[in-house]
């Protein structure tokens, strides 16, 4: 039978390549049984994770899983870094793996796009 503990399904060592100026939604997949836990986002600064208090967040509910979303509108160059979501559940703190955002500043983007950029943004080949 399925565990009724809260589980946060951010993949270990996951990464996202994003462009400054674009909107972006960072998802924290959350599994819970009865009551939706209180979830927060933080940004890693060395070994400490600084809570993101004043950022826009929202929930997206799907059939078997929910997503706690951190909104970047737009992405800024200093959004580069590693993020983690945490859930408070029955006075336990559950922490996700961290996920890393690699922000490319359009103004300083190198002339040669990466393989990932070419796959997700074929128009980069023709700029």
């Amino acid at each position: 039978k399925e565990s009724c503990d809260v589980q946060l399904y951010i993949k270990r060592q996951s990464e996202h390549s994003i462009l400054a100026g674009d909107p972006f939604e960072l998802e924290c997949p959350v599994k819970y049984c009865a009551n939706r836990p209180h979830v927060t986002w933080c940004k890693l600064n060395g070994t400490t994770c600084v809570k993101l208090e004043d950022r826009q967040t929202s929930w997206k509910e799907e059939k078997n899983i929910s997503f706690f979303i951190l909104h970047f509108e737009p992405v800024l160059p200093n959004d580069n870094g590693s993020y983690r979501c945490s859930a408070n559940f029955q006075s336990n703190l559950i922490e996700s793996h961290s996920t890393t955002l690699y922000v490319t500043d359009v103004k300083s983007a190198s002339e040669r796009p990466s393989k990932d950029e070419m796959a997700s943004r074929p128009w980069l080949l023709y700029r």
Epitope: R12, E15, H16, T47, D116
Partner: antibody, heavy 121, light 112 residues
Framework: EVQLQQSGAELVRPGASVKLSCTAS????????VHWLKQRPDQGLEWIGR????????KYDPKFQDKATITADTSSNTAYLQLSSLTSEDTAVYFC??????????????WGQGTSVTVSS | DVVMTQTPLTLSVTIGQPASISCKSS???????????LNWLLQRPGQSPKRLIY???KLDSGVPDRFTGSGSGTDFTLKISRVEAEDVGVYYC?????????FGGGTKLEIK
């Protein structure tokens, strides 16, 4: 049941390219990582790279960066490995492997049966 | 790259006797989440590799308890308490924390 079904053996000419496929069943590749590994005849295992099919983000061993391109199609639950400018050094068996799984222990747990690539003129 | 050094290269063991394989990494495999990402797999002749042990000591489902994994940091060991005929093949350790992922050179277990 979790399975990774790889495409059939390939015999290719030097200088050509080849694209291998790895179709998953029993799980959604979007939820996990897919890795590709190389094993030359009677040799050890070499890690080529991995893809996060949820966002297409890849990581490669630098020595395969210009040789290999890993992609994924979540609609068909399939990952691909394209090898370019083939030489005899690329003659090997290539394995796709899942990393992730239901308990998220992050150790490659399910392996495809391997695809043999022979480069010969 | 993290170098994974496996010894011995070949292990010739009588059925029923114990066997031990060492794996040393050039960097610590302890991650910030407190887990150590050292894994062992077995490749039987003519087959794909199969996961045997993950996170140093956790046995994959279906793996008999005569196998044990131990170690920490950079020094790890796989032990088989009583070797059986089905244990023949090549054993690899590999690390799952640093990129690129790297493997030991393999230890071939054969029956004496």
């Amino acid at each position: 049941e979790v399975q990774l079904q790889q495409s059939g053996a390939e015999l290719v000419r030097p200088g050509a390219s080849v694209k291998l496929s790895c179709t998953a069943s029993g799980f959604n590749i979007r939820d996990d990582y897919v890795h590709w590994l190389k094993q030359r005849p009677d040799q050890g295992l070499e890690w080529i790279g991995r893809i996060d099919p949820a966002n297409g983000k890849t990581k490669y061993d630098p020595k395969f960066q210009d040789k290999a391109t890993i992609t994924a199609d979540t609609s068909s639950n399939t990952a691909y490995l394209q090898l370019s400018s083939l030489t005899s050094e690329d003659t090997a068996v290539y394995f796709c492997v899942r990393e992730g799984g239901s308990n998220y222990d992050y150790a490659m747990d399910y392996w495809g049966q391997g695809t043999s690539v022979t480069v010969s003129s | 790259d993290v170098v994974m050094t496996q010894t011995p290269l070949t292990l010739s063991v009588t059925i029923g006797q114990p066997a031990s394989i060492s794996c040393k990494s050039s960097l610590s495999l302890l991650d910030s989440d407190g887990k150590t990402y050292l894994n062992w797999l077995l490749q039987r002749p003519g087959q794909s590799p199969k996961r045997l042990i993950y996170l140093v000591s956790k046995l994959d489902s279906g793996v008999p308890d005569r196998f044990t994994g131990s170690g920490s940091g950079t020094d790890f060991t796989l032990k088989i308490s009583r070797v059986e005929a089905e244990d023949v093949g090549v054993y690899y350790c590999w690390q799952g924390i640093h990129f690129p992922r790297t493997f030991g050179g393999g230890t071939k277990l054969e029956i004496k």
